[in-house]
């Protein structure tokens, strides 16, 4: 229903901490090189005013809508101009076209450096003297760095990181209690932030009913004794706050989330047997927790998807009376009879089976012709097996660094125009997914390999869109989203590519290199190895691997060295000419 | 037994309003996904639209995206489709139907909508 005062209505829904946080989230998110202290201030001043708008909701400007509020407030900021440039210029124009103007400028990749957590008794003293303020901080610098981030799973995260902080800091060894801990929630929030990434992609390149699509798909997976219509009701809704969200209406997506999963818990019958343990939850872990239940148990008296979907002799008709339900159909059965597929499969499945009855239900003869759709789904259901079979057991093989390895090296062909540290980064996300899914039961591995490759994916032709370079990835990118993994998958070494010089500085390393966190050395390591490729894109496997097994010894012996500078300086040039020679 | 009553129908011009109405009746109304589907003369059905028990609405055919919105008032076992700018081509048979499952289950009589100057 509608309400005299928008800001009232969600500040009486969510409460002051959550308003606050949201708040904070969403400047956070548009306006990406302001400090927390600046962005703290606005909070509060957008609080005190949605506190008077609470006890009279016909207070000045009260009846304003939310774009325009946070609006004007970001548009009051000093050296708006000098800070952001063209964003200013966002500032004269009317909302909605102001609100499309800063998600415009929202930067996938802003220039902040990396955040670094703090030395663990630090981390305690300023959690223990502020923890409002502490959580704040954390919000912030996460915020600006993804903003696209799920701001109520946002708030979800820094609870947890809340909860570790007030165990481990009663601890007498902090760091060991807080290193494994805050590691892990850092891996999940950055997955998360890539997977609700792709959901924006997909809301805003091929609107709402690709992503519903993609909901109905994941739905059906986890909630089989759901209807059809209770699915649809669902993924209807998530739909929605998906796109709250992904335009910037925080506070609108999370009071929208929170009804949804009031919605699910007071229809557990309907919906799925596994809900409880979620519903038993307080909000932020409900709804975190109803993201990502267990699939319920499939019902055994499923018939075969032909009957209605081959052999009906009424398929045309029932297609042409309402083509969207129909397909929907289709895919809500064909889901929740394959937990074990992908979603990106299962709506390539659903794309061909469409494409089928366009070109069927024209013909004199409409059975005879889409008789064979099911047949004709085995190449695209064999395609994503291979790739998890062949990857895993490289995975299996090799480990994590050097699966990354491979993979970067298998990229860095396909696309050797693409930047090093954008093929380094995609390259180890891309090799993260044998640690994350390659140790999962069979069934689980094709849906977590695929729809996790896809994020990846998603995030590299996001970053390519800035600075296109390549042909191969802007071809890609540029098609459908469910088509991109198979895409990418396909390229082979890019055949134009004019090879780089050999430049012996790009191989030169200083005894620095030493001290540097392990990850900051692979990081190092990798960043030669792509340089490499690129200088020889056709170079075999076993040269690449001798050249590196060669760096890793030199590594090692002259950081073990006494004299580590001239062991570097001397032993370097010998490095960067048995490479030449090993590569030649 | 299951009922269903439409009410609402006549002529209209075109770019004008109607509003369609479906007494339900013998069935628990607020747990059932109900819809709306029209026929045009000499043509075959074609689905409007669909509204969960919850009210929302989980279905509208592209022809009338943005014209037509369906409601109910679960308290009055009531379903609605509200048909603004109306233009020829709506001309139909718009029948009010119970959806159980898969498919529709049970159908009204029909009521005529006629556009036309």
């Known amino acids: 229903e509608a309400h005299k005062s928008e800001i009232a209505h969600r500040y009486n829904d969510l409460g002051e901490q959550h308003f606050k946080g949201l708040v904070l989230i969403a400047f956070s998110q548009y306006l990406q090189k302001c400090s927390y202290d600046e962005h703290a201030k606005l909070v509060q001043e957008v609080t005190d005013f949605a506190k008077t708008c609470v006890a009279d909701e016909s207070a000045a400007n009260c009846d304003k809508s939310l774009h325009t509020l946070f609006g004007d407030k970001l548009c009051a900021i000093p050296n708006l101009r000098e800070n952001y440039g063209e964003l200013a210029d966002c500032c004269t124009k009317q909302e909605p076209e102001r609100n499309e103007c800063f998600l415009q400028h929202k930067d996938d990749n802003p220039s902040l450096p990396p955040f670094e957590r703090p030395e663990a008794e630090a981390m305690c003293t300023s959690f223990k003297e502020n923890p409002t303020t502490f959580m704040g901080h954390y919000l912030h610098e996460v915020a600006r760095r993804h903003p696209y981030f799920y701001a109520p799973e946002l708030l979800y995260y820094a609870e947890q990181y809340n909860e570790i902080l007030t165990q481990c800091c009663a601890e007498a060894d902090k760091e060991s209690c807080l290193t494994p801990k805050l590691d892990g929630v850092k891996e999940k929030a950055l997955v998360s932030s890539v997977r609700q990434r792709m959901k924006c992609s997909s809301m805003q390149k091929f609107g709402e009913r690709a992503f519903k699509a993609w909901a109905v798909a994941r739905l059906s997976q986890t909630f089989p004794n759901a209807d059809f219509a209770e699915i649809t009701k669902l993924a209807t809704d998530l739909t929605k706050v998906n796109k709250e969200c992904c335009h910037g209406d925080l506070l609108e997506c999370a009071d929208d989330r929170a009804e949804l999963a009031k919605y699910m818990c007071e229809n557990q019958a309907t919906i799925s047997s596994k809900l409880q343990t979620c519903c038993d939850k307080p909000l932020l872990k409900k709804a975190h927790c109803l993201s990502e239940v267990e699939h319920d148990t499939m019902p055994a008296d499923l018939p075969a998807i032909a009957a209605d979907f081959v052999e009906d002799q009424e398929v045309c008709k029932n297609y042409a009376e309402a083509k969207d339900v129909f397909l929907g159909t289709f895919l809500y059965e064909y889901s929740r009879r394959h937990p074990d597929y992908s979603v990106s499969l299962l709506l390539r499945l659903a794309k061909k089976y469409e494409a089928t009855l366009e070109k069927c239900c024209a013909e004199a003869n409409p059975p005879a012709c889409y008789g064979t759709v099911l047949a004709e789904f085995q190449p695209l259901v064999e395609e994503p097996k291979n790739l998890v079979k062949t990857n895993c057991d490289l995975y299996e093989k090799l480990g994590e660094y050097g699966f990354q390895n491979a993979i970067l090296v298998r990229y860095t062909q396909k696309a050797p125009q693409v930047s090093t540290p954008t093929l380094v980064e995609a390259a180890r996300n891309l090799g993260r997914v044998g640690t994350k899914c390659c140790t999962l039961p069979e069934d689980q591995r094709l849906p977590c390999v695929e729809d996790y490759l896809s994020a990846i994916l998603n995030r590299v032709c996001l970053l390519h869109e800035k600075t296109p370079v390549s042909e191969h990835v802007t071809k890609c990118c540029s098609g459908s989203l469910v088509e991109r993994r198979p895409c990418f998958s396909a390229l082979t070494v890019d055949e134009t590519y004019v090879p780089k010089e050999f430049k012996a500085e790009t191989f030169t390393f200083h005894s620095d290199i030493c001290t540097l966190p392990e990850k900051e050395k692979q990081i190092k390591k990798q960043t030669a190895l792509a340089e490499l490729v690129k200088h020889k894109p056709k170079a075999t496997a076993e040269q690449l691997k001798t050249v590196m097994d060669d760096f890793a010894q030199f590594l090692d012996t002259c950081c073990k060295a006494a004299d580590k500078d001239t062991c570097f300086s001397t032993e370097g040039p010998n490095l960067v000419t048995r490479c030449k020679d090993a590569l030649a | 037994e299951v009922q269903l009553l439409e009410s609402g129908g006549g002529l209209v011009q075109p770019g004008g309003s109607l509003r369609l109405s479906c007494a339900a009746s013998?069935?628990?109304?607020?747990?059932?996904?109900m819809g709306w589907v029209r026929q045009a003369p000499g043509k075959g059905l074609e689905w409007v639209s669909l509204?969960?028990?919850?009210?929302?609405?989980?279905y509208y055919a592209d022809s009338v995206k943005g014209r037509f919105t369906i409601s109910r008032d679960n308290s009055k076992n009531t379903l609605y489709l509200q048909m603004n700018s109306l233009r020829a081509e709506d001309t139909a048979v718009y029948y009010c139907?119970?959806?159980?499952?898969?498919?529709?289950?049970?159908w009204g009589q029909g009521t005529l909508v006629t556009v036309s100057s």
């Open positions: 509204i969960h028990p919850s009210g929302t609405v989980i």
């Open positions: 139907a119970r959806w159980s499952s898969r498919a529709f289950d049970y």
């Open positions: 013998g069935f628990t109304f607020n747990h059932y996904t």
